[in-house]
């Protein structure tokens, strides 16, 4: 860029040391240097302003996006806490239902045992009743009475 | 820095107002000022360019990081939704199992009641049968028939 | 700004081409231009430094915020994994409890069937016993024996 040119031409100003006056060419070299520097600075100012504005714009977009992301993260954190509570309640409920099932199972097991006992009792009752029925004399026909009648008659 | 030096030495240029010509020393002072300003500007340009480059680099890293973090957040949000659905299904299932258990319990309770009734009936049957057996005349030995036989004989 | 003024006045330096010397006014114009440029550069340096400092400040806060948000996101991700594991265990447990309930239900159903059978048996036993009791001769008063006694007497 114009700025990066070294104005080393200034070192050769007025090679005639005896002269007390400035040469017009020297002044023109100076004026040209000043003009170049001015333009260089103008370009740089313009370019730098633009770049800094771009940076601020980008930073502002980041700022907004960052804020939104922070909100979203906080929201997720909240929902996750809620989910954790729900899961805990579910675990508790699940445990209750499991205990309920175990209790039911225990009740059922004892009921099964009692049912077996009841079945045995009923079976025994049936046998008893069967024996009783088989050994039961027919009311109008007692064999002893019949034989006695025959004997008496 | 060189930039911050105030070029106030210019104010003392050519103290001889009558002279229409510029003194070489004055021009050399000017040339020196211009040289210093040029160097100062060159340094500042160099430094500013470096800083702006650093900033843009940092911004690019932020950009990438931000994008990744946003993706991660969206991913977490999605997984959280999925987890929410799973948890909801679990709640429904848990409710179903709980209702199933309650229904089972209700069935079991009524079965227990019926079992008690059945036990009572069986007990009553046993008592009846026991009475019947105890009161049953031994078929070959009716006491009346025996006494009658004796009487007749 | 001072920088944006174009130093076009330099073009009219020393209209007398024959003169080999520099006019004091020309040098003063140059000196003034140099002074203005110096001040302009000083202002711009100051302003740019301030803006770049602001940007770096913003970037540092972002850096910190970004780091914290990343940590928070990682934390949420971890907790979410943990929650996922817990939910999976819950699903397994829920399935177990469901199977337990189904098994219980199956046991209960078969128990209900056996209870119905048992009820039928008990009912049949009751009927049998009722019949037996109704048809049972009163031990001290067999009608045949009574009639036989009468006959014999």
């Amino acid at each position: 860029s114009r700025i990066d040119q070294d104005n080393s031409s200034f070192d050769s100003l007025s090679p005639e040391p005896k002269s007390r006056f400035a040469m017009l060419d020297d002044v023109k070299i100076l004026a040209n240097g000043l003009l170049q520097l001015g333009h260089g600075l103008k370009d740089f100012v313009h370019k730098t302003k633009g770049q800094i504005n771009d940076i601020f714009q980008k930073l502002n977009i980041f700022d907004q996006s960052f804020y939104d992301l922070s909100l979203q993260t906080s929201e997720i954190k909240e929902e996750e806490k809620e989910l954790r509570r729900t899961t805990y309640k579910l675990q508790v409920k699940n445990e209750e239902v499991k205990n309920m099932s175990l209790e039911l199972n225990s009740k059922l097991e004892s009921l099964l045992e009692e049912k077996i006992l009841l079945q045995q009792k009923v079976k025994y009752l049936e046998e008893q009743l069967t024996n009783l029925i088989q050994n039961q004399p027919e009311t109008p026909e007692h064999p002893e009475v019949t034989s006695l009648k025959t004997f008496v008659e | 820095s060189r930039i911050d030096q105030d070029n106030s030495s210019f104010d003392s240029l050519s103290p001889e107002p009558k002279s229409r010509f510029a003194m070489l020393d004055d021009v050399k002072i000017l040339a020196n000022g211009l040289l210093q300003l040029g160097h100062g500007l060159k340094d500042f340009v160099h430094k500013t360019k470096g800083q702006i480059n650093d900033i843009f680099q940092k911004l690019n890293i932020f950009d990438q990081s931000f994008y990744d973090l946003s993706l991660q957040t969206s991913e977490i949000k999605e997984e959280e939704k999925e987890l929410r659905r799973t948890t909801y299904k679990l709640q429904v299932k848990n409710e179903e199992v709980k209702n199933m258990s309650l229904e089972l319990n209700s069935k079991l309770e009524s079965l227990l009641e019926e079992k008690i009734l059945l036990q009572q009936k069986v007990k009553y049957l046993e008592e009846q049968l026991t009475n019947l057996i105890q009161n049953q005349p031994e078929t070959p030995e009716h006491p009346e028939v025996t006494s009658l036989k004796t009487f007749v004989e | 700004s001072r920088i944006d003024q174009d130093n076009s006045s330099f073009d009219s330096l020393s209209p007398e081409p024959k003169s080999r010397f520099a006019m004091l006014d020309d040098v003063k114009i140059l000196a003034n231009g140099l002074l203005q440029l110096g001040h302009g550069l000083k202002d711009f340096v100051h302003k740019t430094k301030g803006q770049i400092n602001d940007i770096f400040q913003k970037l540092n806060i972002f850096d910190q915020s970004f780091y914290d948000l990343s940590l928070q996101t990682s934390e949420i991700k971890e907790e979410e994994k943990e929650l996922r594991r817990t939910t999976y265990k819950l699903q397994v447990k829920n399935e177990e409890v469901k199977n337990m309930s189904l098994e219980l239900n199956s046991k209960l159903e078969s128990l209900l069937e056996e209870k119905i059978l048992l009820q039928q048996k008990v009912k049949y036993l009751e009927e049998q016993l009722t019949n037996l009791i109704q048809n049972q001769p009163e031990t001290p008063e067999h009608p045949e024996v009574t009639s036989l006694k009468t006959f014999v007497e």
Epitope: N53, F56, N60, D63, Y67, S74 | - | D54, Q57
Partner: antibody, heavy 120, light 107 residues
Amino acid sequence: EVQLVQSGGGVVQPGRSLRLSCAASGFTFSNYGMHWVRQAPGKGLEWVAVVWYDGDNKYYADSVKGRFTISRDNSKNTLYLQMNSLRAEDTAVYYCARDIITSRPTLDYWGQGTLVTVSS
Amino acid sequence: DIQLTQSPSFLSASVGDRVTITCWASQGINSYLAWYQQKPGKAPKLLIYPASTLQSGVPSRFSGSGSGTEFTLTISSLQPVDFATYYCQQLNSYPLTFGGGTKVEIK
């Protein structure tokens, strides 16, 4: 040099309105979020409201929500606070302040403050 | 909302003393805390932001530390210009909140 010059304070009756202004210079106004903070006599600082760079996003303290409106005119480098339905408890010195970044608001430059007295 | 509690409310000290002010947050705010100095009739002035970064132009005798819920502002050697009221402010989330303030007086 960053400067925030405030105006618009004064004595006002309860239920009436007032508009505060804050003129900014020495920085690119549109690049910064701006806040209003107040301080009741002898009390601590209380944040009132914020407006983001572009003027689109605004947030308020619960105590002023629905009554106060923050706004900005980037072309005029000016920040405003429109205060309606004023109450005695709104009596305070009101400060405008610039922040470094708005998602993590650090207030690096403040105005000189303007006193608002709500009294009948 | 995040509450900030400052301790002590008043502090009497002499020039050259080491002074420590504490600020507690009602919930974790990472390092998002700023410290301000306010002199009577003047606007607050930013001293420290994100817990420990010194604002440009602030003397190095001021320092900040802490993270999470407990933060401290330390003045290593109190100077006559340091007699003022100090406020902490959380910059973690809106609404912004300030501590109640700590008034540092000459003993």
